[in-house]
Amino acid sequence: ELLDPCGYISPESPVVQLHSNFTAVCVLKEKCMDYFHVNANYIVWKTNHFTIPKEQYTIINRTASSVTFTDIASLNIQLTCNILTFGQLEQNVYGITIISGLPPEKPKNLSCIVNEGKKMRCEWDGGRETHLETNFTLKSEWATHKFADCKAKRDTPTSCTVDYSTVYFVNIEVWVEAENALGKVTSDHINFDPVYKVKPNPPHNLSVINSEELSSILKLTWTNPSIKSVIILKYNIQYRTKDASTWSQIPPEDTASTRSSFTVQDLKPFTEYVFRIRCMKEDGKGYWSDWSEEASGITYEDRPSKAPSFWYKIDPSHTQGYRTVQLVWKTLPPFEANGKILDYEVTLTRWKSHLQNYTVNATKLTVNLTNDRYLATLTVRNLVGKSDAAVLTIPACDFQATHPVMDLKAFPKDNMLWVEWTTPRESVKKYILEWCVLSDKAPCITDWQQEDGTVHRTYLRGNLAESKCYLITVTPVYADGPGSPESIKAYLKQAPPSKGPTVRTKKVGKNEAVLEWDQLPVDVQNGFIRNYTIFYRTIIGNETAVNVDSSHTEYTLSSLTSDTLYMVRMAAYTDEGGKDGPEFTFTTPKFAQGEIE
């Protein structure tokens, strides 16, 4: 018999339920007690190297001491039994680990899947964390035969793939047992025919064919998975344009039985579409396959569906009897071009006179016209045909434009610059919106867009910058020519000015001073200047602030002290904050003009 260990703890490897009570007993060997001259009274219990209070001990007899824990909350407790030997030295007798956790809960939501070509896999919800090694066993049987147990692996404890091959059209019963050191529970049993749990392989070899006759259709063909010989399939077919992120779906009722091709209709011409397809058992019992690999195709071209936006500009410096007119138009977006644009056709007809034709590859045409009224038309052409014509009246030189839009407003919203107006009473064919950045350093380079005559609110479709002042002009266009333009200034987003105003004195008296300043250049304003503040002070005095309306460029400071040095600076404010200008100093005279000491 060995003196080491000097005793033992019972139970040796305890597993206890969390928040339960637990008692351990340390029994000393008689020879050890004899060697160390101790008995159970000398036992010291420790958990994780901390001494347990004596109140938790019970001396059972000369050789045995017990310790009781109530409401165990730790998952892992190192418990040691020690003896106080000669001179209060502690000698370890024995140690155990108390493992605590919870019994397994009844597994729930048991479900099985048969992936085509693979064996059946079942999964379940194992319930709460037990903090213990818990083994899950999937059990299955026919009415006449028990299958081998499927033991879930440690790294995937809530699923298991059976070892036997799937037989369709015979019902199977399946359940799960969960077991750990604290108990064993069984799930509800489920009974099913594996044919209702099939997840087919996705259709493959998906291909897309276009049609020369119809620019709005594409034909899909595919190869069905082998499971089609066991079950009838239904399909989901989804498609999107190449650049889109969301999918559209063919109505499911159109693809509700086994097939290997489908024609998709109502598509846009000359557009690349991406398709994918999946399938499942036609009665909806089972699982959808994964999506097939994507396949793409391009619909055939169609003639352009819309005439381009069309406008003109007249060079103000015109020679006697003639004027230079620049006709401008916008490239059609792909969904309206419906194919590769080949060229543009422009016709110009002088009022009740002969017609001139132009074929142009660019998006502008400069022509010399007489001072008469002209009718211009524009069509765009692709491989299939021509668009409808955009018609524009270029009025005679003496034409007086009237009927502007009313209540023109411009405002930023959702990172866009919106423009709205009240429509004139007269029938408007279209509106032309023009805008440019106002700058002291560069000319106003205009961008433009066209809106239908029914529109009275839109946003500027350009690359707009923050803290820039945009001059926006709205021109209504009538059958006989353009109406009067209306303009407004706006900012996409204001900021504080980049510089403050530079203040100076215009006139200084004994008790007052007239200050003046220049309006800030538009390039440094960064927004609408709403007001100015003048700050002035003496070397020893407090600062005084005076608010001044933004329309002013001078202001008189009164009640000043004579023969005194003043420091003054000025700030300009937009809706987003202010910026100070440089400080300026002046001294009031000791006497007023003509005054003697």
Epitope: L3, E30, K31, D34, Y35, H37, N39
Partner: antibody, heavy 115, light 108 residues
Framework: QVQLVQSGAEVKKPGASVKVSCKAS????????ISWVRQAPGQGLEWMGW????????DYAQKFQGRVTMTTDTSTSTAYMELRSLRSDDTAVYYC????????WGQGTLVTVSS | DIQMTQSPSSLSASVGDRVTITCRAS??????LNWYQQKPGKAPKLLIY???SLQSGVPSRFSGSGSGTDFTLTISSLQPEDFATYYC??????????FGQGTRLEIK
């Protein structure tokens, strides 16, 4: 203070038995065991066995198994060691010692085995 | 059985010397080793128990060390009354308890 007092010297004939006593005082007799050790003339120490004064459990060295008996009388705080079938090589000083630590020893009892 | 081997079996030293006696166990005995001193005609006396604990009443010049299989008894400064025979003994495995063969310490 702790004392272990042994019985006096004995002379025995081969084949006879000897019973040596060891009276303990100065501590609680039942709290610790008694070990027996002998030492032949000019030789080293040889452990014979141990008895628990509390439970009466005992351990004997293999060499003495069947020939030795160790007992205690708690009423008198005395331990006894009886060795039977004595041989001449059993001639030695027999010591009792307290516990398995041998922290206190008796004065020794000389047992001479001679024909 | 566990064999205990002491070395040297005898040694000569002078008063004031530092003396070391070693004891080797044939297998690990943890720290369950005691050292005894025996003078002629007297019962042995416990010096050190549990490898390094000094028995009460024993002078502090005696010290013990070691664990497992190798142990040492050291007398830091030899006194005239220290000339005797010294035994090591293991209590780890019982039965049997075993002693070393002894080391005789003589005056040089």
């Amino acid at each position: 203070q702790v004392q272990l007092v042994q019985s006096g010297a004995e002379v025995k004939k081969p084949g006879a038995s000897v019973k040596v006593s060891c009276k303990a005082s100065g501590y609680t007799f039942t709290s610790l065991g008694i070990s027996w050790v002998r030492q032949a003339p000019g030789q080293g120490l040889e452990w014979m066995g141990w008895i628990s004064a509390y439970s009466g459990n005992r351990d004997y060295a293999q060499k003495f198994q069947g020939r030795v008996t160790m007992t205690t009388d708690t009423s008198t705080s005395t331990a006894y060691m009886e060795l039977r079938s004595l041989r001449s090589d059993d001639t030695a000083v027999y010591y009792c010692a307290r516990s398995l630590r041998f922290d206190y020893w008796g004065q020794g009892t000389l047992v001479t085995v001679s024909s | 059985d566990i064999q205990m081997t002491q070395s040297p079996s005898s040694l000569s030293a002078s008063v004031g010397d530092r003396v070391t006696i070693t004891c080797r166990a044939s297998q690990s005995i943890s720290s369950y080793l005691n050292w005894y001193q025996q003078k002629p005609g007297k019962a042995p006396k416990l010096l050190i128990y549990a490898a390094s604990s000094l028995q009460s009443g024993v002078p502090s010049r005696f010290s013990g060390s070691g664990s497992g299989t190798d142990f040492t008894l050291t007398i830091s400064s030899l006194q005239p009354e220290d000339f005797a025979t010294y035994y090591c003994q293991q209590s780890y495995s019982t039965p049997p308890i075993t002693f070393g063969q002894g080391t005789r310490l003589e005056i040089k």
